[in-house]
Structure formats: structure tokens, C-alpha cells
């Protein structure tokens, strides 16, 4: 003991009371209040334990410290007062932090930040979906553009060339960002142009499977181009590729006029007001793609006529000749709008095709590709009429949008009856 009558053997975290006794410091406790032997110890009191009288208040957490405690705002909350720590509920000024507007979030650029009470979540942008195996609405959610996700090889078709094409498309989709829409569109069309110029083992598939592949390519291309073109800036774009594929696109904000897209072998005219779906805030897009290479895959594709047209043709012609499928005279073109509801246009669209010469006494038909339930399809004429045809050009008018072409059907046109000609 020292000269001042204070015990020198007091355990850690205690102070002497007198020469023979010690007491634990505030925030520590021992078995008995007064310590009379150096064998006793002072243990930290956990003020944050459930039975404790400490109350930090809402949106806060109690942190035990050596000999004391601190109240701090819970993650996702911050003190209005600016004081990082406090001691009781009356000093609590914790309120929710909006991580989204304050930029304190770590959402991927493919997602949108949503503030929640005390936290935030990252949701896929509209038209995007979570990457394979990653849940939506998490802090680490990463998404991909759905524009590409459905454009995968058609089931049951085994082609190494087609597989390579779709791997390239999926790679483009994986790396896609809205600012790259222009490049991505061009890359997809280049890949398609290359595929159709060099179809490889696609040409060894049975004809029906080739038609299914063509149907799948046309359908997917239209969806992808529609999705991507909404991210383009206003104006007119024209791209052409070595094997003859061509794209014309016009993007506008608010317009009330007709639009004409011109290409090497096709011209399309329609009203702008068809392009926009009511309530859709995005830009209006009108697009036309010429795909001459698609003709290879659509060789010998069937033509299905509606009964009335069939009857009319049989009245004016001797009937379909036995040598089979109609001949594709023109490039296959695909027309699309930002509005995907194009099955019944309020005013018709007009196409002018340049094409190979028509063989005399054959019937020229304006047709569209009708996608069948089985994923394949056939040529059809419903909603399309042939306005006029010359040797190497044909004007078509249609009340819907799809993929179009001019066919030459093997009908034997009757010789004119001179008596009827005189009467006429």
C-alpha cells in the first residue's frame, strides 16, 4: 500500500477506495461491489445487452465499447445533427439516407437504383432482365438487354454456321450499352450479311428447316432493330453491306407527315403517325431492311392464298402450273416501326420494288412472310394488294407490316378473247 492509504494491488479497470479495498470503474463490474482481493476482476458491462436500460431509439444501433457504449445510426441512415455518436434516444436524429439520389449506391449501369427504408436495391432497367443466375432487386444485380435474349438459335436446327452467328449476336447483346446502339445495329447487320452470303451448312438443311431458320431470322431481326433503334438520336441513317443487305432508318420525336425510305431495290412510304404507340414517350422509328441473301433460305417456300384470291386467280388464269413453288423476283425486305402493333394500320403502307424481269404470262404477286405457329411460315397475300407491275418494278400496298417480297407465281395467263376485248 502507498503512503496515501490507497491499495496498490487494484485489478485492471478499477480504482482504490482505501488501503484495503478497490471499486470497478464506471462501465465495469465485479462479483461484489467492493474488491478486497487482487484475485477479483472487473469485467466490461455490455450496456447494449437486451436487459440493459440503454435505449438508443429507432433507426440506430448500440455499440458496446470498453467501459462504455455508443449509439450510432443504422446502415442506410444518417444523423441530421451531424454527430456520429450519441448516448440516448433524446439525442437520436437518425433518418433514412436516399442512397440513390445521393450517389452512395453501387448499382450497375444496367440497373435502376430504388431507395428503400434504410437501404436500396438495384432493379433491371425497363426492357432488361437479370443476367443468368443473378436475382433481380439486389445490390449486386446485373442485367442484360432483353432485346437480344430471345434471339437464339431455333430449336431442333443443327447448324454450325448458324450457331456461330448467334454466338456473335449474344456477344453483342452482352456488351450492349444504349450509347452503342448505332454500332450494335451495324454489327448485327454485318454478321447477318456474312451469314447469308456464306450460309455454309444451312444450305444442307431440309428446305422446311431452311424456311424455319429464315422465319426465325426475320422475326428476331425485326425485334432487335426495333429495340435498338429507340436509343438512336434523331435523323436518317442508311447502312449497306457487301452482300447487299441494306438498312434505312428514320428517327423523329414528334412528327405529323408521311415518310419515304429509299433503297437500291425498294422504296417504302407510310404515315408517321403509324409509328408511335399512344402513350409511348420514346422517339418514333421507321425502318426498312433489304435482305437479298434471305432469298437463298426462302427458295421453294410455299405460297398460301386466301380462298377468294385463289378463286379469282383461277377465273383469270388457267391455274397453278405443276412445276411447283413460286419464284422470288425481288429482295426480301422487312419493315418495322417503334410501335410493334402493326397488324392493322390505319392507313396503308406502299412499297415499290425493283426486281428481275417478269416472264410473260406469269402472275406477279405482292406477298408477306406469315410466321406460322410452328415457328416456320409461308408466303401469303392477305392485306396486301398489287397496285401495278411493269417488267422490272411492282408497286404493293399493304395494311400491315412484316417482311415482304414480290413473287412470280407459275400461273398460265389465258390468251385474250378478241370478242371480249372488243366488248370491253
Amino acid at each position: 500500500q502507498d503512503s496515501r492509504g490507497c491499495a496498490r494491488w487494484c485489478p485492471q479497470d478499477s480504482s482504490c477506495v482505501n488501503a484495503t479495498a478497490c471499486r470497478c470503474n464506471p462501465g465495469f463490474s465485479s462479483f461484489s461491489e467492493i474488491i478486497t482481493t487482487p484475485m477479483e476482476t472487473c469485467d466490461d458491462i455490455n450496456e447494449c445487452a437486451t436487459l440493459s436500460k440503454v435505449s438508443c431509439g429507432k433507426f440506430s444501433d448500440c455499440w458496446n465499447t470498453e467501459g462504455s457504449y455508443d449509439c450510432v445510426c443504422s446502415p442506410g441512415y444518417e444523423p441530421v445533427s451531424g454527430a456520429k455518436t450519441f448516448k440516448n434516444e433524446s439525442e437520436n436524429t437518425c433518418q433514412d439516407v436516399d442512397e440513390c439520389s445521393s450517389g452512395q449506391h453501387q448499382c450497375d449501369s444496367s440497373t435502376v437504383c430504388f431507395n428503400t427504408v434504410g437501404s436500396y436495391s438495384c432493379r433491371c432497367r425497363p426492357g432488361w432482365k437479370p443476367r443468368h443466375g443473378i436475382p433481380n432487386n439486389q445490390k449486386d444485380t446485373v442485367c442484360e438487354d432483353m432485346t437480344f435474349s430471345t434471339w437464339t438459335p431455333p430449336p431442333g436446327v443443327h447448324s454450325q454456321t448458324l450457331s456461330r452467328f448467334f454466338d456473335k449476336v449474344q456477344d453483342l447483346g452482352r456488351d450492349y450499352k444504349p450509347g452503342l446502339a448505332n454500332n450494335t445495329i451495324q454489327s448485327i447487320l454485318q454478321a447477318l450479311d456474312e451469314l447469308l452470303e456464306a450460309p455454309g451448312d444451312l444450305e444442307t438443311l431440309p428446305r422446311l428447316q431452311q424456311h424455319c431458320v429464315a422465319s426465325h431470322l426475320l422475326d428476331g431481326l425485326e425485334d432487335v432493330l426495333r429495340g435498338l433503334s429507340k436509343n438512336l438520336s434523331n435523323g436518317l441513317l442508311n447502312f449497306s453491306y457487301p452482300a447487299g443487305t441494306e438498312l434505312s432508318l428514320e428517327v423523329q420525336k414528334q412528327v405529323d407527315r408521311s415518310v419515304t425510305l429509299r433503297q437500291n431495290q425498294a422504296v417504302m412510304q407510310l404515315d408517321w403517325n403509324q409509328a408511335q404507340k399512344s402513350g409511348d414517350p420514346g422517339p418514333s422509328v421507321v425502318g426498312l431492311v433489304s435482305i437479298p441473301g434471305m432469298g437463298k433460305l426462302l427458295a421453294e417456300a410455299p405460297l398460301v392464298l386466301e380462298p377468294e384470291k385463289q378463286m379469282l386467280l383461277h377465273e383469270t388464269h388457267q391455274g397453278l402450273l405443276q412445276d411447283g413453288s413460286p419464284i422470288l423476283l425481288s429482295d426480301v425486305i422487312s419493315a418495322f416501326l417503334s410501335n410493334n402493333d402493326t397488324q392493322n394500320l390505319s392507313s396503308p403502307v406502299t412499297f415499290t420494288f425493283s426486281h428481275r424481269s417478269v416472264i410473260p404470262r406469269q402472275k406477279v404477286l405482292c406477298v408477306f412472310w406469315e410466321h406460322g405457329q410452328n415457328g416456320c411460315g409461308h408466303w401469303a397475300t392477305t392485306g396486301c394488294s398489287t397496285i401495278g407491275t411493269r417488267d422490272t418494278s411492282t408497286i404493293c400496298r399493304c395494311t400491315h407490316l412484316s417482311s415482304f417480297a414480290v413473287l412470280m407465281a407459275h400461273y398460265d395467263v389465258q390468251e385474250e378473247d378478241p370478242v371480249l376485248t372488243v366488248i370491253t
Epitope: H132, S163, R174, L180, T184, S187, P242
Partner: antibody, heavy 125, light 107 residues
Framework: EVQLVESGGGLVQPGGSLRLSCAAS????????IHWVRQAPGKGLEWVAY????????YYADSVKGRFTISADTSKNTAYLQMNSLRAEDTAVYYC???????????FGWGLDYWGQGTLVTVSS | DIQMTQSPSSLSASVGDRVTITCRAS??????VAWYQQKPGKAPKLLIY???SLYSGVPSRFSGSRSGTDFTLTISSLQPEDFATYYC?????????FGQGTKVEIK
């Protein structure tokens, strides 16, 4: 800096197995597609296998189909080539390479832009 | 499978020479062809993609062209560092295939 480093090569007896690794840095395997290409001593390049990160699809040369398996572990940022039923004719330097898409205003296309240094596989009794 | 037939298999040239290597595809591959340079004991390096596009960082003396199924790599003025083996590769269809290589040696 983009880098690919192969490992796992060595001497193995005919019929044996090896697993080659291709560790990527400077980019993520989850957002790239990877090829394995081999080169027998004094010979030319032969494509072996490919894995697409986006579709998960895999393709193989006929000479290795059914014996080799390509895979990727995104958490380790590594691609693998599991080689079973090895033959003397599989002796080669094995390279992994990144399949990259180039897109600018005037040119578009694909190519193998980064390659590893290669790892030697010797199949011999 | 698509065969890529490269010619010549080797050639001797001097610094400053114009060198042309050709590659013929057994069927149409469109423009999906790349060219690589490989030096002994090293990995190949990409020179040209999409038949005629120069990869970044590659000197402009290298160029590629296409005529149907024939593809050409041209080195306009051969430099000492260009002595190597060159390979063409088609990327149109699986399996991806390489040409057998052309070795460019010093005359």
C-alpha cells in the same frame, strides 16, 4: 492490362488426364468468350474448343469431341480445358485466347485479340 | 468443315520487299477472316480482322483484302521484325479453322 496465363501442362501417359487453366486479368471471363488453340511441335495452329460466356454454349474440334471439356469459373475469372483419354497426337503447346468483337464507326468484326503464353502438354509413355 | 488453304507455305524476301500471302476458303466464308503473326516460341498476334480491318497498334504496312473466297495479306514494305509465320483463320462457322501457315524468311 489484359492478360491470359495458362497453367496445368506437363507430361502425361496415353489415356491419362490433365486440366489446363487459363487465368484472366484485366477483363472478366464472365463477359468474354474464350477459345483454346493448340500447336503441335513444328506444326501450325489448330483450333480446339470455344465457350461463349453469354450463351454458355461450347463447341469442339472433331479431333477432341467427347474427350475434352471447356468450362469457366467466373468467381476465379478462369477458363479450363479438361482433357481426358489423352493420345500422343494431343502433344502440343495449348494457348487460350479471348474472342473479341471490334466495332467502330467504320469497321466491325471478330478476332482473337489476346493470347496466353501457352502451356506444353506432352503425351508419352 | 471449311478448309483454309494458304500459299505459299514459305517464302524468302528482303527488307523493303512487298510480300503477298494468300488464303483460299473451301467454301464461302463472307468476310469473316482474320490474319495472325507468330514468332518462334511466342503466341500468335492478331493483325487483321474481318478480312481487311487493321487491328489497333498494327503498322499500316499490313493490309488485308478479299476477292470472293480468296483472301490476301500484304506487307507493303517488309521490315526486319516482320520475319515470322503468318496464319489466316475463318470465323464463319464452327469448327473454326486456320490455314497451315506461311513462313516468311530472310533472303
Amino acid at each position: 492490362e489484359v492478360q491470359l496465363v495458362e497453367s496445368g501442362g506437363g507430361l502425361v501417359q496415353p489415356g491419362g488426364s490433365l486440366r489446363l487453366s487459363c487465368a484472366a486479368s484485366g477483363f472478366t471471363v464472365s463477359s468474354s468468350s474464350i477459345h483454346w488453340v493448340r500447336q503441335a511441335p513444328g506444326k501450325g495452329l489448330e483450333w480446339v474448343a470455344y465457350i461463349s460466356s453469354s450463351s454458355g454454349s461450347t463447341y469442339y474440334a472433331d479431333s477432341v469431341k467427347g474427350r475434352f471439356t471447356i468450362s469457366a469459373d467466373t468467381s476465379k475469372n478462369t477458363a479450363y480445358l479438361q482433357m481426358n483419354s489423352l493420345r500422343a497426337e494431343d502433344t502440343a503447346v495449348y494457348y487460350c485466347a479471348r474472342d473479341f468483337y471490334f466495332g467502330s464507326y467504320y469497321s466491325f468484326g471478330w478476332g482473337l485479340d489476346y493470347w496466353g503464353q501457352g502451356t506444353l502438354v506432352t503425351v508419352s509413355s | 468443315d471449311i478448309q483454309m488453304t494458304q500459299s505459299p507455305s514459305s517464302l524468302s524476301a528482303s527488307v523493303g520487299d512487298r510480300v503477298t500471302i494468300t488464303c483460299r476458303a473451301s467454301q464461302s466464308v463472307s468476310s469473316a477472316v482474320a490474319w495472325y503473326q507468330q514468332k518462334p516460341g511466342k503466341a500468335p498476334k492478331l493483325l487483321i480482322y474481318s478480312a481487311s480491318s487493321l487491328y489497333s497498334g498494327v503498322p499500316s504496312r499490313f493490309s488485308g483484302s478479299r476477292s470472293g473466297t480468296d483472301f490476301t495479306l500484304t506487307i507493303s514494305s517488309l521490315q526486319p521484325e516482320d520475319f515470322a509465320t503468318y496464319y489466316c483463320q475463318q470465323d464463319s462457322s464452327y469448327p473454326i479453322t486456320f490455314g497451315q501457315g506461311t513462313k516468311v524468311e530472310i533472303k
